[in-house]
Every structure is written in structure tokens, then in C-alpha cells.
Interface confidence: low
């Protein structure tokens, strides 16, 4: 790992440089303000549950601007190449316990491919505990539960989302590492499709059990703003969305799934350079509060409300929004204090508190619907073999195999 920054200072650069406020080097899209789901600057994805095409309805976002982030989920710190801390944030996968490192041979030999991986711990993403993620060859991790055709649109952790083709070179690998407290994905010596002469990229994303997310960049051979997005989106940052079901106007008995991006952090691509790193530290969210008192007395920047029937604290903007609406939580919480709930039957229509909107029919439906024809808008294919066939448990040179292609 050279050059190794030594004397420039470790934590210095990121210091105090947070997404909470107008910050140099970051553009925050004004997507997270509370309000009606249909507000015009939200990104919406819609999909017929009947297996129809997924349309991405992005309404004109002419309010995109650098804004003060008054709805923060993460504090973000950038460490420049002259920061020793950027070196410290790099996880040396080659030095890790071999049994915890896996070369994903399918991802390492193909282009526009994605594969599900199960974590050994619950990773809190925007306050939601996740056990499964989807690694894509295109330099990002899809964090959604429901696989759809537009993985690159939202619900991602993207150290550098671009049109990478690990299949171009035998030296290119997609490696991941899980030691029970951190999960690291490394895109190692990967080349941009059509831009192979620029050289190889090596970078990683680390998901820590405490919710921290680290992007570390070892080799970035070209200026990121110069990377073409004509064939594949180019993004660096985080995004999350919630999914709601509503009746389809065309087929009344069917339900249409819509995905709404409620928060996004975008890193200025010019800041992505060799030996730099970005660390996202999660801020408290409403979801962490387990009682009405804690919820209503929360001094978070979020407007937390308590839903008695769900026994859940929420701002209404998280992945459980469907339940929040279905159980009338928005209306229930309006103007009510915790004392107002004291006399109510604690068990009335109370579902399992660990229930998520993806736990029931939705997951089952989506799995059977998509598993045979899974392509994203950039033609990233899902590889269902999360374990076993697609993996090597060591760091020996990868062998070229026949790539598994799903869909068309």
C-alpha cells in the first residue's frame, strides 16, 4: 500500500466535517424533508407486481442544490491522501484470516453481475438491521431486500459505482471478508469497460457492525468526474428508500410497488482519489427508541413519533413506512403524548415488533418473480449463488470459469 501517508495527520481532514451542515466536497440533494410521499422532488420507482416492467419516474429535480442537512442519518468525514488515517481505514484483506476471505469467482469473471451475500452480523443501515446484501461488479453494494431491475437507482452503498468489468483481466477480483465485526468488499484491480487503458481501480467498502461505513480508495488511476455515465451510472455515496404498495390503476386486483428514495448522500467525485477514504458514522434515528417516552422526548433532528399499535418510534421516513401508513400511525401520533396511550390495551392488533414490510408476501413474491429474469437498468444480473459455487475461500489466483448469466 504505497504511497503510505505518514506525517500528514490522521483524523485531521475529516474532523468536524459532517453532512450536517453545508459542507465542502459534498452535495446533498434535497430529498429528505418530511412531507407527502408524492412531493415533486422525490425519486420514485414503480413496478407492477404482475411482473411487468419497472419504470423509474424521476420527476424534474430542479431543486437540487447544496443544502443544510437537517435530516441527517450520517456524519461524513473525508480523509485526503495525505492523511495517515486514510491508510488506517484501508483493510488489508491479504493479511486477514484466510477462512474469512472469499474471492467471488463469478463476480470476478463477469461484467454487470450481482450476487447476494449473507452477513455474519446485523448491519444497521439507516437504522435498519440488515443481514443480506447484494454485491455488484459495478463498484457498489445493493442494500435492498427486494431485488428489482434498477439496482443502481437507490438503496446502495457505493464507494465508486461505475461500469467496471472484472472479467476483462485475470488480475481483477471481487473479494469479500467477514470477521464478525466488519464486512469488507474489495474491488481489486478492476477496469472500466471501454477505458481499460486508463489502468485498474482498487477500492473497498467496509460495513462495520456499529453501522459505520468506510470507503477506502487505494488506486484510482483517473479523474472520477471524467468517467462516462452513458453506459452505467457513476455515483459515490449512500442512498436509501422505502417501498409502498398501492393498487394499480390498470388492474384493480393487482398491487403496484413503488420505491421512494428518502435520503441520499453524494460525494463530490473529484474528492475520490488514490489513498483517500471516507467514513460515514451513523447518527441516532427514531427507530432506536423502544419506548414512547424515549421516542417523544428524543432531541434528534428527526421529528420522531410513537405508534402505539406497532410499538415503534419513527419519523415516518424509513423502510417500515408501509406499516406506518397501514396502521394509521401518522394520524394516531398526531398531537398525542405518551400519557394518552396509557389506558389503551397494549396488545390491540399489535403485530410482531420485528415484523418488516419485506417479511411476508413481498419477499416471497419478489423472489419467485425475479429470480429467473433479473436484470437491472444497467443490465446487472443477479447471481443467486451467494455461497458455494461462486466462492473461493482463499486468495489463490482466480480461475476462469463459465459465467452464470441470468435473464437476457
Amino acid at each position: 500500500l504505497s504511497p503510505q501517508p505518514g506525517a500528514g495527520h490522521d483524523e485531521g481532514p475529516g474532523s468536524g466535517w459532517a453532512a450536517k451542515g453545508t459542507v465542502r466536497g459534498w452535495n446533498r440533494r434535497a430529498r429528505e424533508s418530511p412531507g407527502h410521499v408524492s412531493e415533486p422532488d422525490r425519486t420514485q420507482l414503480s413496478q407492477d407486481l404482475g411482473g411487468g416492467t419497472l419504470a423509474m419516474d424521476t420527476l424534474p429535480d430542479n431543486r437540487t442544490r447544496v443544502v443544510e442537512d437537517n435530516h441527517s442519518y450520517y456524519v461524513s468525514r473525508l480523509y485526503g491522501p495525505s492523511e495517515p488515517h486514510s491508510r488506517e481505514l484501508w483493510v488489508d484483506v491479504a493479511e486477514a484470516n484466510r477462512s474469512q476471505v472469499k474471492i467471488h469467482t463469478i463476480l470476478s469473471n463477469t461484467h454487470r453481475q450481482a450476487s447476494r451475500v449473507v452477513l455474519s452480523f446485523d448491519f444497521p443501515f439507516y437504522g435498519h438491521p440488515l443481514r443480506q446484501i447484494t454485491i455488484a461488479t459495478g463498484g457498489f453494494i445493493f442494500m435492498g431486500d427486494v431485488i428489482h431491475r434498477m439496482l443502481t437507482a437507490t438503496q446502495y452503498v457505493a464507494p465508486l459505482m461505475a461500469n467496471f468489468n472484472p472479467g476483462y483481466s485475470d488480475n481483477s477480483t471481487v473479494v469479500y471478508f467477514d470477521n464478525g465485526t466488519v464486512f469488507v468488499v474489495q474491488w481489486d484491480h478492476v477496469y472500466l469497460q471501454g477505458w481499460e487503458d486508463k489502468g485498474s481501480f482498487t477500492f473497498q467498502a467496509a460495513l462495520h457492525h456499529d453501522g459505520r461505513i468506510v470507503f477506502a480508495y487505494k488506486e484510482i488511476p483517473m479523474s472520477v468526474p471524467e468517467i462516462s455515465s452513458s453506459q452505467h451510472p457513476v455515483k459515490t455515496g449512500l442512498s436509501d428508500a422505502f417501498m409502498i404498495l398501492n393498487p394499480s390503476p390498470d388492474v384493480p386486483e393487482s398491487r403496484r410497488r413503488s420505491i421512494f428514495e428518502y435520503h441520499r448522500i453524494e460525494l463530490d467525485p473529484s474528492k475520490v482519489t488514490s489513498m483517500s477514504a471516507v467514513e460515514f458514522t451513523p447518527l441516532p434515528t427514531c427507530l432506536q427508541h423502544r419506548s414512547c417516552d424515549a421516542c417523544m422526548s428524543s432531541d434528534l433532528t428527526f421529528n420522531c413519533s410513537w405508534c402505539h399499535v406497532l410499538q415503534r418510534c419513527s419519523s415516518g421516513f424509513d423502510r417500515y413506512r408501509q406499516e406506518w401508513m397501514d396502521y394509521g400511525c401518522a394520524q394516531e401520533a398526531e398531537g398525542r403524548m405518551c400519557e394518552d396511550f396509557q389506558d389503551e390495551d397494549h396488545d390491540s392488533a399489535s403485530p410482531d415488533t420485528s415484523f418488516s414490510p419485506y417479511d411476508g408476501d413481498l419477499t416471497t413474491t419478489s423472489s419467485s418473480l425475479f429470480i429467473d429474469s433479473l436484470t437491472t437498468e444497467d443490465d446487472t444480473k443477479l447471481n443467486p449463488y451467494a455461497g458455494g459455487d461462486g466462492l473461493q475461500n482463499n486468495l489463490s489466483p482466480k480461475t476462469k470459469g463459465t459465467p452464470v448469466h441470468l435473464g437476457t
Partner: antibody, heavy 117, light 111 residues
């Protein structure tokens, strides 16, 4: 307004010691790495030493390693440079600077250290 | 001998454009490390002029601009004014030495 105010400079004999201080205000001191940069009379700038936000990590130029010690007291918003075994070539104006993203965003007015017999 | 090389002096008439070069090597500027520029007016402390190769802190006139290519960088000053007369220093990071490094400084004289 960000202010960095150095003090403690003066005339000292070769082999002697001196302790420089830098009082910081106008920003959250513990959020920033800090550095000392010096400038010999009529010469250019030379990075001397740096310290991480919490003070756990310290860094030195080869020319001062083993003789100078950088430290900080975040409760007092103060940066220090303990200089021992001073030499004539250490004569310079010493600046403390706030460090961010690889550059020195704010500088103090400097304090002159003269090493002479 | 400074790690980064700058011309000792440059000069220009008011209103003219001048450039100051800063040449490094493959272990600093050429390795991709950012270049920063400082202005030091006579008898005062250095002031950050350009950071991250091309960015101006608030309060710095847009007459000042920075660029970087390969192992060198340059500072351009357009519409030269008398108050621009000062010493200018470039700074980067050297991965081999493991330290912040400065250029030797360039004295700008406004004729």
C-alpha cells in the same frame, strides 16, 4: 473568527530548551489535527511537526525528531511544542496551523525563536 | 533544497497575467497528491490561497486559480494588482518521505 495565537518564543542558547504554545479559538479545537510550520529568516516554509485530533498520533520532520515534542490539551484549546537541544539552525518564526484535507487552512501570526550564544 | 521546485521570482505589470510553477516528482504531485498554494504578504503569516489543486477558499478573488498536471502544478494570477506583491508557496504531500512538503517559494514583484 478563527484565531491561533502563538507564544513562548525568545532567545535561547544552543543546547537550551523552549516551550511554544498556541491558543486556539473560533473553532472546535478537538475536531482538527494541528501542525507546527517554521520559517527561517529570509527562507521558505518547513513543516516541523503534526498531531492528530485526539493527540494519540504525533509526526515529526527528520530534522527535529528526538528533540521536539508536540502535544495538545483539548480542554484548554492549546497546542504545544517542546523544543530541546536547540541548535542555531532551529532559529525561525514558528507558526501553528490548523490542518484539513492535506492543507493548512489557518495560520497563527508566528513566534520568533532565536538560538544564539 | 526544497522537494517541490518553484522559480525564485516572477514579475509582471499591473493588469497582466502571471503564472508560478511548482514541479514535484512521482512520489508527491505525480503520485496524485493534492497541491495547495499559500500567499505570504511581507511581514505576515502565510494565508491559504488555493487548496486541492483548484479550489479557492471564500474571500480569495477569482483572479487566482490553480491547476495540476502530471508531476507539476501552477498558480495563475490574472489582472495583477499591486497588493498581490508577496511570496507564494506551493505545498503537497510526499508519500516516500511521509511528510508535508513545501516549495522554496516564489517572490512576485508587481512592476
Amino acid at each position: 473568527e478563527v484565531q491561533l495565537l502563538e507564544s513562548g518564543g525568545g532567545l535561547v542558547q544552543p543546547g537550551g530548551s523552549l516551550k511554544l504554545s498556541c491558543a486556539a479559538s473560533g473553532f472546535t479545537f478537538s475536531d482538527y489535527a494541528m501542525s507546527w510550520v517554521r520559517q527561517a529568516p529570509g527562507k521558505g516554509l518547513e513543516w516541523v511537526s503534526g498531531i492528530s485530533r485526539g493527540g494519540a498520533r504525533t509526526y515529526y520532520a527528520d530534522s527535529v525528531k528526538g528533540r521536539f515534542t508536540i502535544s495538545r490539551d483539548n480542554s484548554k484549546n492549546t497546542l504545544y511544542l517542546q523544543m530541546n537541544s536547540l541548535r542555531a539552525e532551529d532559529t525561525a518564526v514558528y507558526y501553528c496551523a490548523r490542518y484539513l484535507f492535506g492543507h493548512y487552512m489557518d495560520w497563527g501570526q508566528g513566534t520568533l525563536v532565536t538560538v544564539s550564544s | 533544497q526544497s522537494v517541490l521546485t518553484q522559480p525564485p521570482s516572477v514579475s509582471g505589470a499591473p493588469g497582466q497575467r502571471v503564472t508560478i510553477s511548482c514541479t514535484g516528482s512521482s512520489s508527491n504531485i505525480g503520485a496524485g497528491y493534492d497541491v495547495h498554494w499559500y500567499q505570504q504578504l511581507p511581514g505576515t503569516a502565510p494565508k491559504l490561497l488555493i487548496y486541492g489543486n483548484t479550489n479557492r477558499p471564500s474571500g480569495v478573488p477569482d483572479r487566482f486559480s490553480g491547476s495540476k498536471s502530471g508531476t507539476s502544478a501552477s498558480l495563475a494570477i490574472t489582472g495583477l494588482q499591486a497588493e498581490d506583491e508577496a511570496d507564494y508557496y506551493c505545498q503537497s504531500y510526499d508519500g516516500r518521505l511521509g511528510v508535508s512538503v513545501f516549495g522554496g517559494g516564489t517572490k512576485l514583484t508587481v512592476l
